[in-house]
Amino acid sequence: GKGDPKKPRGKMSSYAFFVQTCREEHKKKHPDASVNFSEFSKKCSERWKTMSAKEKGKFEDMAKADKARYEREMKTYIPPKGETKKKFKDPNAPKRPPSAFFLFCSEYRPKIKGEHPGLSIGDVAKKLGEMWNNTAADDKQPYEKKAAKLKEKYEKDIAAYRAKGKPDAAKKGVVKAEKSKKKKEEEEDEEDEEDEEEEEDEEDEEEEEDDDDE
């Protein structure tokens, strides 16, 4: 749960370790100075881009170690009662389709990052949201159409996937399956929305690492 203090701290990327180090260095040099986070993250981003693979290696090692720590701690972590433990995610299960806005973000994230290289993940998301709001309804249509098509495909794929997973389902009849399907999909919707956010965060972290502008 988000509020569980016993839950292991999330794993950090190599870039996150680098930023943390930058912050510590800055604090040592300027203990009383207040930090302009926009400026600071821009400087960090620029510095990271000029670093060699060897220099980045130290932070990559830290990230690897932290990933191992996180996985180790998660194995023994027991969520508090009332919180349903996240179901095992089958990597072969059909991937939840992106929303129209998610497709729009995939299209325009490089643009925003190219024009504003120092922006934090949160600010990039904010700009994308603003850009989406500034897009006319007609221009949102292609994204909505594509999202609807992908949703349709996903629904077919997930039905086939579930049928494959339960060979006896055909004998018992489709009616029962349909009833439980609705409930299951509602649960999955909540879960997958979280996944979509997680994936976008990961993608942003990676992109922040190998941002490349002309």
Epitope: E107, P110, N134, A136, D138, D139, E214
Partner: antibody, heavy 122, light 108 residues
Framework: EVQLLESGGGLVQPGGSLRLSCAAS????????MFWVRQAPGKGLEWVSR????????YYADSVKGRFTISRDNSKNTLYLQMNSLRAEDTAVYYC???????????????WGQGTMVTVSS | DIQMTQSPGTLSLSPGERATLSCRAS???????LAWYQQKPGQAPRLLIY???TRATGIPDRFSGSGSGTDFTLTISRLEPEDFAVYYC?????????FGQGTKVEIK
Amino acid sequence: EVQLLESGGGLVQPGGSLRLSCAASGFTFSSYDMFWVRQAPGKGLEWVSRISPSGGYTYYADSVKGRFTISRDNSKNTLYLQMNSLRAEDTAVYYCARLRYFDSRGYAFDIWGQGTMVTVSS
Amino acid sequence: DIQMTQSPGTLSLSPGERATLSCRASQSVRSSYLAWYQQKPGQAPRLLIYGASTRATGIPDRFSGSGSGTDFTLTISRLEPEDFAVYYCQQYGTSRWTFGQGTKVEIK
């Protein structure tokens, strides 16, 4: 220097085809929406088509829908307009233009090519 | 579709004079969706104003834009010889990016 350079215009018979190109330089081409805008002799400006940064989403003016196809090759920094079933009313100077998003202050075409003339006549 | 009507069609003025160009939309347009362009004979259009009132990079401050809703204005405070050209307003409110028919500013 940020630049757009159109080519491929010329004289074509009604019903014929033509492919226009627009070579971009001086900016990250793959980050921008690109447009074709045309101007008939002595007339005003009319938008023709739009393509998203990746090329995955395209838009057309009703007057060219089903006849024109916009595409791009980001590896070559080039925008294209394939024009089929050309009509006399397609005669115009065709400009490629870059769409710039100015944060909350909206959108505008900030960079234009010099244009290429397309004449449809028998 | 939103129609953009510019007036007057032609404006005959002398250098140093003030030029006021009007652009009226057939329905309300968000200010952030309105731009002005200048076009000289044989040349491509050039962006002057975006977001109804923000000057584009390199545009002299004698050019200013104002207005909201359906009525927008481009003002050139003191006409310079190089300002004699055709001016277009343009809106974006649907996927149809419509331009006005243009106002020609000519030397009197």
